[in-house]
């Protein structure tokens, strides 16, 4: 007997599709090799239709796949749009021939089923209502008009004309007619189950006389909808219920052995495990909704249903539409920290992938706020300014080609604590869910700036200095000065690179910024911060305020540390002074700004593509050319 | 709840036939799938059969034991299954167990593991003489 493991017999109707799994043994091998679906001919020979090496034969070009799902042991061939010429037997197998490990399937694709003349078929989803048509001749007018459903022995009473009406049916039956026609009376049924499927007879008059008509109510359990969807990445439900459920409540949620357990709905219910990575979105009057999960995790899998009711929970006889979502472990998005944890008054860098094909693509970085039906309103992104209320502390990094865009936060607060995410106006399956927690400081910042209280003097120079431990020694330093757009790097001067010494002085690990002369656009926030290749790492901010010199005031007297700096600056006979006017010559540049302008400029995109390519003439003549700057106003 | 009520188990002697059935019962329940499994004295519960739909689909699942003996189906409205059992074998005595599943979850989840079936019935004794 072959370990393979599948259906033996898969009929359906044309038009239809299927979804056919093969089990296969839990084997490393297995897992890797060639999965395949073929044809089995009147030789014997086995014609493959499909694969998992990317082979589609012609005949299932546009309806079909052949996904695996290595962590089940499992591989699911969906074939769509059936015809009859599908049927045949076939073979579900693996190995790198067709002769390999496989299973026999026999497929059936029978016509639609043709139903006698005299049957009407309606044919509804759960939830839904149905308006059965009974026409009648003119003298059966006056008469009693009912229907009744047929069961074993007799047929049960529905609903008459004279208000009789089953229990079963009370307020879900309505007998009618239309304007002064008087040919045709109507039955509607709403809120419809499983139980009022089955065979009905609507009837006008008594006797030999009476009209009669059969009816045929199919009511259906929505089909699921099958979604897969790769691990750590964001799936949408769109729900469509129709416009008569349009003011009631909607939810969804995740079927278990019994019920069905909500996750979330519109009256602020949401289930804890979904906490930062769900949003509900209303999309229009007609009853339509969206869910949004992101941060996919492989026991998100299973079979959802969403809904709509008052009590925002599943009923009996409201419409609902199903999803069947398989998690892939096979994933193209990269595993990251999805949490990430600071101090207050310290920083975070947040690296956020994206498609790396869609390096051109907007980035942007949003915070989930729970409240309500959930809503994540964007803090910062490459074209969106940042928030008021994040000034002087949040930037966003775009690093273009390389997957990863970094978004830093500085001066964290525990009201920092929270959900965000990372989203593109991109492929929706990367958006990517960080927690972020902030932890009450317990020692000294790693990088410190002096003065701290910084004010600086109109046409004066200005040094500010930044302090880091021995722990960053190998990494760059650099010093970028704040806008809404983002944080352009400066040309920085690293006094503790020039030391020869082996060992590490804590006291004069200094990276210095001086300002030459000071001019009123200066003032801003500044941070200093460091980074290895396209890895950023902390940073702190410092507000510079200018003043104009009150008249008789005396120079004022740079700190010890600023002197100090000056004097290591006099050695080297540098002036790692910076031009502000000439750093917002081009302030966002797009990925193709020219690459010389940048360069000047020491535009942040041209500082990164350099640092991450160190090996290059370029990356080095840029990182040293930042300690021999000299801009003067 | 969900209540499963198996029936047609009996006495049937070597190279016989049995038609077993098994009936779904339970407001609003609409199973996805329904299946068969047996268990002999001393012996670990077996897949015997299953079958699965999903709109105008059905699949169907046999077990090697008795793959060409054995075969499953289901009524119209998908409440009843039944095993229709040919060429019976001594081996094939045990008490047969209906088994049925609300969720769709074929793909991720083999019919043939007990463990992973909702719904029990409490069983059908069938016989086999020789």
């Known amino acids: 007997k072959s370990p393979i493991f599948g259906p033996q017999e898969v009929s359906s109707i044309e038009g239809d599709s299927v979804s056919i799994t093969c089990y296969y043994p839990d084997t490393s091998v297995n897992r890797h090799t060639r999965k395949y679906w073929c044809r089995q001919g009147a030789s014997g020979m086995c014609t493959t239709l499909i694969s998992s090496n990317g082979y589609l034969s012609k005949e299932y070009s546009g309806r079909a796949n052949l996904i695996n799902f290595p962590e089940n042991n499992t591989f699911v061939i969906n074939i769509e749009q059936l015809t009859q010429d599908d049927t045949g037997s076939y073979k579900c197998g693996l190995g790198t021939s067709n002769r390999g490990l496989s299973f026999d399937v026999s497929l059936e694709v029978s016509q639609v089923p043709e139903l006698p003349s005299d049957t009407h078929v309606y044919t509804k989803d759960i939830g839904r209502n149905v308006t059965i048509e009974c026409p009648f001749k003119r003298e059966n007018a006056p008469s009693k008009k009912s229907l009744c459903k047929k069961t074993n022995q007799s047929c049960e009473l529905v609903i008459d004309s004279t208000e009789k009406v089953n229990p079963s049916y009370i307020g879900r039956a309505k007998l009618f007619m239309k304007g002064t026609d008087l040919t045709v009376f109507y039955v509607n049924i709403s809120h419809l189950t499983h139980n009022d499927a089955g065979l009905y007879i609507c009837q006008a008059g008594e006797g030999p006389s009476a009209d009669k008509k059969n009816v045929d109510l199919q009511v259906l359990a929505p089909e699921p909808e099958l979604l897969y969807k790769d691990l750590r990445s964001s799936v949408t439900f769109e729900c469509d219920l129709g416009r008569e459920v349009a003011n009631e409540a909607k939810y969804l949620c995740r079927m278990n052995k019994e019920t069905c357990d909500v996750i979330i709905n519109t009256l602020g219910k949401r289930d804890p495990d979904f906490e930062g990575r769900i949003l509900i979105t209303p999309k229009d009057d007609n009853g339509r909704f969206s869910v949004l999960i992101t941060g996919l995790r492989k026991e998100d899998a299973g079979h959802y249903q969403c809904g709509a009711h008052s009590s925002g929970l599943p009923q009996e006889g409201w419409p609902i539409q199903t999803w069947q979502l398989f998690v892939n472990e096979e994933s193209t998005i990269p595993n990251r920290r999805s949490v990430v944890k600071g101090v207050t008054g310290g920083s975070v860098a947040i690296a956020c992938p994206y498609n790396p094909k869609e390096s051109s693509s907007l980035k942007y970085w949003c915070r989930w706020e729970g409240d309500g039906n959930g809503h994540c309103p964007v803090l910062v992104g490459t074209q969106a300014q940042v928030q008021e209320e994040y000034e002087g502390r949040l930037a966003l990094f775009d690093q273009p080609g390389n997957g990863t865009y970094t978004v830093i936060l500085n001066q964290l607060t525990t009201e920092d604590a929270g959900f965000y995410w990372c989203l593109t106006n991109g492929d929706s399956r990367w958006r990517t869910t960080i927690e972020l927690q902030v932890a009450e400081a317990t020692r000294e910042p790693n990088l410190e700036v002096t003065p701290q209280n910084a004010t600086a003097v109109l046409g004066e120079t200005f040094t500010v200095s930044c302090h880091y431990p021995c722990k960053f020694y190998s990494q760059e330093k650099y010093w970028c000065k704040w806008s809404n757009k983002g944080c352009h790097i400066l040309p920085s001067h690293d006094e503790g690179a020039r030391q020869s010494s082996v060992s590490c002085d804590q006291s004069s690990q200094l990276v210095s910024m001086t300002l030459n002369p000071v001019s009123k656009e200066d003032e801003g926030w500044y941070w200093c911060g460091v980074k290895q290749g396209q890895t950023y790492g902390e940073t702190t901010a410092i507000y510079i305020a200018v003043e104009e010199r009150t008249r008789g005031s005396s120079h004022v007297n740079p700190t010890d540390a600023n002197a100090r700096a000056k004097v290591a600056l006099e050695e080297e006979v540098v002036d790692s002074s910076i031009s502000e006017k000439e750093n917002k010559a081009i302030p966002n540049p797009g990925p193709f700004a020219n690459e010389r302008e940048i360069q000047n400029v020491g535009d942040q995109a041209q500082e990164n593509r350099a640092s991450g390519d160190a090996g290059s003439a370029d990356g080095q003549s840029r990182s040293s050319s930042s300690k021999h700057h000299h801009h003067h106003h | 709840q969900v209540q499963l009520v198996e029936s047609g188990g009996g006495l049937v002697q070597t190279g016989g036939s049995l038609r077993l059935s098994c009936a779904a019962s339970?407001?609003?329940?609409?199973?996805?799938?329904m299946g068969w499994f047996r268990q002999a004295p001393g012996k670990e519960r077996e897949f015997v059969a299953a079958?699965?739909?999903?709109?105008?689909?059905?699949?169907?699942y046999v077990g090697d034991s008795v793959q060409g003996r054995f075969t499953i189906s289901r009524d119209a409205a998908g409440n009843t299954v039944y095993l229709q059992m040919n060429s019976v074998k001594p081996e094939d005595t045990a008490v047969y167990y209906c088994?049925?599943?609300?969720?769709?979850?074929?793909?991720?989840?083999?019919?043939?593991?007990?463990?992973?079936?909702?719904?029990w019935g409490k069983g059908t004794l069938v016989t086999v003489s020789s």
């Open positions: 079958i699965r739909w999903s709109g105008a689909t059905t699949y169907k």
């Open positions: 088994a049925a599943d609300r969720v769709p979850k074929d793909i991720s989840i083999d019919p043939r593991n007990p463990k992973d079936w909702d719904y």
């Open positions: 339970g407001r609003t329940f609409s199973p996805y799938a």
